[in-house]
Structure formats: structure tokens, C-alpha cells
């Protein structure tokens, strides 16, 4: 008789997770000297250890403990980029700028990014039936409280000036529910991070307008202002430029030292 | 280093046309935006026109909207402003420049410019 | 669209600092980009990206931007810094636009 399985709202663990995320560490190790010590076969099982088994609304930071031990990376504190709701032009960004780093240029980000994963209580199974949506279902799904974690730590290392992109064609642009509203911002150290600079993507080819005086931006700048960080805000227009440079990125023109 | 040569400058009557060129060398064309800048004799600079790098997307100054328009060759790393209906206002020395990259829109390479004047 | 607004001229005694201003409404929230240009020369780049210096460009030329006023820098000037300077930012579509340049003395 088949045992009866939790029907949860959101999508199941994505098919083939354990060995995409050994992949991906096999390869990130391979492009990244400074992560050539890593295990990645003990990467793995530190990551399996963090929901297998476990109640999938019941995940803690704590559960992620030896995966972040194992991960742990430095990065250029003052060459971090941030991003909301943008995240593709953010990742093309940093493909190109090769001195800037997003979370999912880190070890860490690249093994999880687009990734679902949970599993079941009392079983050493992965369910790649369905997994808890974080609004239907709960908030400490393995998958939430991991983008927690690393998000935290991420922010909690950025130092000097922190760049982060927002998208402006959003309603939304600053959105406090969003990972970077909800975690980062509140993580960034005012001991270590002097400011924090929002580029505002705009869409439209003929987009004049100053988004940098909506309000929901000037709702960031409160937050980040109370934090004892100073706040800039850049119109970015013709983010076309980003992406030409993502056909060939070793051209001149995809740097932006001059 | 990086080139960048405007040519087809001279003397039109108002009304005429003329067309300018930029040929551009020393770094790789296609993955510019490209701009024209004009300066009036005495006066301060005004930016004219500016073309993606692959050339879907063009701008121009109000001034000029209507009557110039800016194209690009890739294949011969060459940049033009061909310039219709011309008036005494539009006589100036222009300039080709290269745009600066990623997130910055200004311009990190002049060429030495081409004269037009515009007068009967 | 933004208008800059530059003095007409500035003068400094060699080895001074010189500061030239550019305003315009809510200026610090685009970047903004300075150009010197000599007689009969074209414009060069000195400041990109409100305070950037491209390779070349001595270490005496700074630039910042803050509320609506952009400022260029130049500490130790010297005889050869004297020339006309252009402010310049990007506010979309197709609205770019040059401040009305600062011709710089050097006393």
C-alpha cells in the first residue's frame, strides 16, 4: 500500500537535484582556484543533511550550518551587487564585469540558483512531487530559509559601497517583501558599508522619467538612512548595452574601466 | 589605440544636404554606441544623435529631429550623419564619439571633428 | 528635461584648487560626466560616472555629486589644466545634454 505523501502548493524538487547540484559544484570548483579545496561530494551530503528527513516547514538556518561551513567563500566586500526582481540583468552584468559579484557568483548561489528542492519527514526520500509554496504553505520550507541564509551572510560581508539593481518597470520597485527588502537591506553592516547605491533599470527605450523619486525609493532610502548608511540613487537607462555585451564578453566594451 | 576620423565637412547652402563620416578603428565598432556632437563657432557642445551599437536604435536632438538622420556601417567600422534641409543654426564643427560602457552614457573618445557650414 | 548649469568662468592661482559646479533638479540621481577641451581641440573625458578617473587622466581631477550640484575638483592646478570644461548627464530617450561649459584661468 502506498504511503500517503503530503500534497504541498508549490512545484516539486527539480528532476535530477542531486546530481545538478554535484555538477555544478564539480564545475564551480574546476572555474574557481580559490574553491579548488572544496569536497564537493561532502558539499552534497551537507546539503542533503539540511532537509533530508526533515519536515519541510520545519527548516532552520541552524540545518544549513555545515553547508555553509563547507562553502564558505571571500568575495570582494566593496565589489557586491545586489538585486531585486532583475535578477537576469544583474547576472549578465556581473558576466561582463568580472570584478563585480552577485550571490549566485558564489559557490553557494551557483549550486542552488533556479533550483527546488525538499524532503519528507522520517524518510530519506526527496519529494519531486511538490514542495510548500512559501505564501500557501510556510515560510521555513528548505528552499526559503536557504536563500535566508546565504542572502544574510552575503549582505552581512558587503563593505564600502554596495551596489544593488532594481528593476524599474515594476509597480514595485523597492518591494520591503522581496529577499533583498526583507534580508539584505537589513543585513548590510553600517560599521563596514559607507553607502548603499540603487540602479533603477529603466525598460523603455524612450523612458525619461526619474525613478529614483518614486516612492517606494524613497521608502528604501528611510530604511537605509535610519541604518546610519548613506543611500544614491542612479537612473540606468539603455540596459541594452548590458546585453550586447553578454554575445562577447571579452570585448573592450563590456568593462566599465576606461 | 583607439581612432576615430570625421570627414565630409565643407560649405552648404541653406536648404542643401550633406553627409558626414566617421571611420572608426582600434577597438571593435560593433559593440559601440555611437554618437554626434556639434560645437557652433564660440558656443559650447550640443549632443546631435546617437545609434546602438547594432543599429535597431537611434536618438535624436529635438533640434535636429526630422532632418538628420544617423546610421552605421559594422562592416566597414564606419559611423554617418546624413543631414537634410539644412539651416544657418546647424553650422558647427561635428563631432564623432564613442559612448562609455555598461552602465555609464557619456563619451570616452572624440574624433578631431569636421566643419560645416551652412550659409548662402 | 534637466538643464545644467554651469558659471561662466573660474579663475585659481597655480597650485590652488579649482572648483567648477554644474546644477540641475535632482542631479545626484544620474550620473554625471566632465570634459575639458583646449583651443581647437576636441573634448577629453577627465570624470565619468560622478567621480570616476579614466587611465591618463591625472590623479588632481575629482569629481562628486550630491543633492543638485555636481562639482570637478582640480587640487595643484597647473598652467596647463586652464581650458574650457564641460558638465554633461543622461536622463533617457533623448535627453542628453551639456552644461554651458566653464572656461578655467589659471592666474
Known amino acids: 500500500v502506498p504511503r500517503w505523501r503530503q500534497q504541498w502548493s508549490g512545484p516539486g524538487t527539480t528532476k535530477r537535484f542531486p546530481e545538478t547540484v554535484l555538477a555544478r559544484c564539480v564545475k564551480y570548483t574546476e572555474i574557481h582556484p580559490e574553491m579548488r579545496h572544496v569536497d564537493c561530494q561532502s558539499v552534497w551530503d551537507a546539503f542533503k543533511g539540511a532537509f533530508i528527513s526533515k519536515h519541510p516547514c520545519n527548516i532552520t538556518e541552524e540545518d544549513y550550518q555545515p553547508l555553509m561551513k563547507l562553502g564558505t567563500q571571500t568575495v570582494p566586500c566593496n565589489k557586491i551587487l545586489l538585486w531585486s526582481r532583475i535578477k537576469d540583468l544583474a547576472h549578465q552584468f556581473t558576466q561582463v564585469q568580472r570584478d563585480m559579484f552577485t550571490l549566485e557568483d558564489t559557490l553557494l548561489g551557483y549550486l542552488a540558483d533556479d533550483l527546488t528542492w525538499c524532503g519528507e519527514f522520517n524518510t530519506s526520500k526527496i519529494n519531486y512531487q511538490s514542495c510548500p509554496d512559501w505564501r500557501k504553505d510556510c515560510s521555513n520550507n528548505p528552499v526559503s530559509v536557504f536563500w535566508k541564509t546565504v542572502s544574510r551572510r552575503f549582505a552581512e560581508a558587503a563593505c564600502d559601497v554596495v551596489h544593488v539593481m532594481l528593476n524599474g518597470s515594476r509597480s514595485k520597485i523597492f518591494d520591503k517583501n522581496s529577499t533583498f527588502g526583507s534580508v539584505e537591506v537589513h543585513n548590510l553592516q553600517p560599521e563596514k558599508v559607507q553607502t548603499l547605491e540603487a540602479w533603477v533599470i529603466h525598460g523603455g527605450r524612450e523612458d525619461s522619467r526619474d525613478l529614483c523619486q518614486d516612492p517606494t525609493i524613497k521608502e528604501l532610502e528611510s530604511i537605509i538612512s535610519k541604518r546610519n548608511i548613506q543611500f544614491s540613487c542612479k537612473n540606468i537607462y539603455r540596459p541594452d548595452k548590458f546585453l550586447q555585451c553578454v554575445k562577447n564578453p571579452e570585448d573592450s566594451s563590456c568593462t566599465s574601466e576606461i | 589605440q583607439v581612432q576615430l576620423v570625421e570627414s565630409g565637412g565643407g560649405l552648404v547652402q541653406p536648404g542643401g544636404s550633406l553627409r558626414l563620416s566617421c571611420a572608426a578603428s582600434g577597438f571593435t565598432f560593433s559593440s559601440y554606441y555611437m554618437n554626434w556632437v556639434r560645437q557652433a563657432p564660440g558656443k559650447g557642445l550640443e549632443w546631435v544623435s546617437a545609434?546602438?551599437?547594432?543599429?535597431?536604435?537611434?536618438y535624436y536632438a529635438d533640434s535636429v529631429k526630422g532632418r538628420f538622420t544617423i546610421s552605421r556601417d559594422n562592416s566597414k567600422n564606419t559611423l554617418y550623419l546624413q543631414m537634410n534641409s539644412l539651416r544657418a543654426e546647424d553650422t558647427a564643427v561635428y563631432y564623432c564619439a564613442r559612448d562609455l560602457p555598461l552602465v555609464y552614457t557619456g563619451f570616452a573618445y572624440w574624433g578631431q571633428g569636421t566643419l560645416v557650414t551652412v550659409s548662402s | 528635461d534637466i538643464e545644467l548649469t554651469q558659471p561662466p568662468s573660474v579663475s585659481v592661482a597655480p597650485g590652488q584648487t579649482a572648483r567648477i559646479s554644474c546644477s540641475g533638479d535632482n542631479l545626484r540621481h544620474y550620473y554625471v560626466y566632465w570634459y575639458q577641451q583646449k583651443p581647437g581641440q576636441a573634448p577629453v573625458l577627465v570624470i565619468y560616472?560622478?567621480?570616476k578617473r579614466p587611465s591618463g587622466i591625472p590623479e588632481r581631477f575629482s569629481g562628486s555629486n550630491s543633492g543638485n550640484t555636481a562639482t570637478l575638483t582640480i587640487s595643484g592646478t597647473q598652467a596647463e589644466d586652464e581650458a574650457d570644461y564641460y558638465c554633461q548627464t543622461y536622463t533617457g530617450g533623448a535627453s542628453l545634454v551639456f552644461g554651458g561649459g566653464t572656461k578655467l584661468t589659471v592666474l
Open positions: 560616472g560622478d567621480s
Open positions: 545609434i546602438s551599437s547594432n543599429g535597431d536604435i537611434t
